[in-house]
Amino acid sequence: YSMTPPTLNITEESHVIDTGDSLSISCRGQHPLEWAWPGAQEAPATGDKDSEDTGVVRDCEGTDARPYCKVLLLHEVHANDTGSYVCYYKYIKARIEGTTAASSYVFVRDFEQPFINKPDTLLVNRKDAMWVPCLVSIPGLNVTLRSQSSVLWPDGQEVVWDDRRGMLVSTPLLHDALYLQCETTWGDQDFLSNPFLVHITGNELYDIQLLPRKSLELLVGEKLVLNCTVWAEFNSGVTFDWDYPGKQAERGKWVPERRSQQTHTELSSILTIHNVSQHDLGSYVCKANNGIQRFRESTEVIVHENPFISVEWLKGPILEATAGDELVKLPVKLAAYPPPEFQWYKDGKALSGRHSPHALVLKEVTEASTGTYTLALWNSAAGLRRNISLELVVNVP
């Protein structure tokens, strides 16, 4: 079984018409057909609902060999209708020219503005060559490529012009460009395409870090600040995006920063949300993309209504140890925000030295280590105070 490709009534590979003309292309095939064309909307118009801008697709008379037929009609075409008109088998996934699809490139000539591209950004990396897609509505023009300070002429090698794709340029020639415009002369008039902003990108992103790392706790009304930093090849360009609970509601703003070091570039996006509420709690994801690599990092944001201190025994109120043990931990289960002040006591006397509110670490336990250990926690501003006591029994072997 070999598949017969659809056929068009336009036999030439490219078809030239003028602005204001109408265009009618019919397509016949063995299977149900669909059209794709430059001005097509997400869902093409069908039946009698005529739309001058988007065109209309209607059924037409098939043949015995190709019983399915679709005709595409466009009234009063304009330059932006220039491009590839493709008829393909609707229910066959692969769209292969000459097998499951047939196409013709249509030029809709506009002598008042031969260039039809919109302003855009070009990401220039280390590939050998890249297309500058200044598309034209008129084939056969002599086109040059202009930057802010120089002009490139097609030479068939480092700079190559193609009527359908634009200018193929060796990338080293673009590394000084701020922007690019194609230029041509028609009659006695010069024309410039809309410009392309040139963004030079390195190929490599090395690392991403989102601070604070695992989670961030805040009180309602406080300010949230997250810093997402990417370490990249020197002179790289990166696009940041954030996903977080308040994004749809346009809560917060992200500010980009960049620092170029001798060996690499650090690119950051700082997300700030003033006056957080419970709606802001959840997962915050930073995404970085250089057109080739994609990095992502996430952190959890916890928002508390009020300051609190919660402390419990982790292993019960009485702990046992053996004299001579080099290290004994007296742990507690502590949850608090903001982090409270604290003090450990033994039998009512304050213990000096640096300790943690999560566990008291005793080194070289002796019989004298027996006693009642108390952790006092307080938040003066919020008027909170909590105590917890643990009994340590030291056994002498």
């Epitope: 701020l178 809309n194 960049r258």
Partner: antibody, heavy 123, light 107 residues
């Protein structure tokens, strides 16, 4: 927040060299998405762009035709700043001089400016 | 060199009125390369509009830009007290140049 801080003398003698510096904070002079410009303003000439420097795999410089023969704009990556030198000045060069950033996000329009330095050329 | 001509030189208007400022280029320029600035006495110019119609960060929506080719317009829909200033257009394509400015003053 990007800030540009200008420094340099306010009085220069005719035939001497005018030198100004623009210190950058909040961005990098060697970043690949900005240009660093000098502009001047006088009652007789209005706003006049003088030139720019920018890094794109190498340092580049563009200068206005009117001052091309006597202007130099140099970056200093170690101090994150750039400077203007204008040789052989005459009283015609008396103006307020501004440094400014052109950023790719605004198609290189000048989104941040220095505070301006009034330079008088007089003996 | 592209010459930008702004008109009128001075615009005398009252608070709440609409201001329409014109900028004409000596040859066609891409709208991506046209900007508008506001300058108050003793201050540096401030970017209002770039790419002919895109408002810069923090600029109120009473400022709008339009135009293409050689004719560009800055519109201030309702003048506020802080809007009385000098406005400049600038083209920043091949070479860079500024218009001569339009002063918007209180009538």
């Amino acid at each position: 927040q990007v800030q540009l801080q200008q420094s340099g003398p306010g009085l220069v003698k005719p035939s001497q060299t005018l030198s100004l510096t623009c210190a950058i904070s909040g961005d990098s002079v060697s970043g690949n998405s900005a240009t660093w410009n000098w502009i001047r303003q006088s009652p007789s000439r209005g706003l006049e762009w003088l030139g720019r420097t920018y890094y794109r795999s190498k340092w580049n410089h563009d200068y206005a035709e009117s001052v091309k023969s006597r202007i130099t704009i140099n970056p200093d990556t170690s101090k994150n700043q750039f400077s203007l030198q204008l040789n052989s000045v005459t009283p015609e060069d008396t103006a307020v001089y501004y440094c400014a950033r052109g950023d790719s996000s605004s198609w290189y329009a000048f989104d941040y400016w220095g505070q301006g330095t009034l330079v008088t050329v007089s003996s | 060199e592209i010459v930008l001509t702004q008109s009128p030189g001075t615009l005398s208007l009252s608070l709440g009125e609409r201001a329409t400022l014109s900028c004409r280029a000596s040859q066609s320029i891409s709208s991506s390369f046209l900007a508008w600035y506001q300058q108050k006495p003793g201050q540096a110019p401030k970017l209002l509009i770039y790419a002919a119609s895109t408002r810069a960060t923090g600029i109120p929506d009473r400022f709008s830009g339009s135009g293409s080719g050689t004719d560009f317009t800055l519109t201030i829909s309702r003048l506020e007290p802080e809007d009385f200033a000098v406005y400049y257009c600038q083209q920043y394509g091949r070479s860079l140049s500024f218009g001569g400015g339009t002063k918007v003053e209180v009538k």
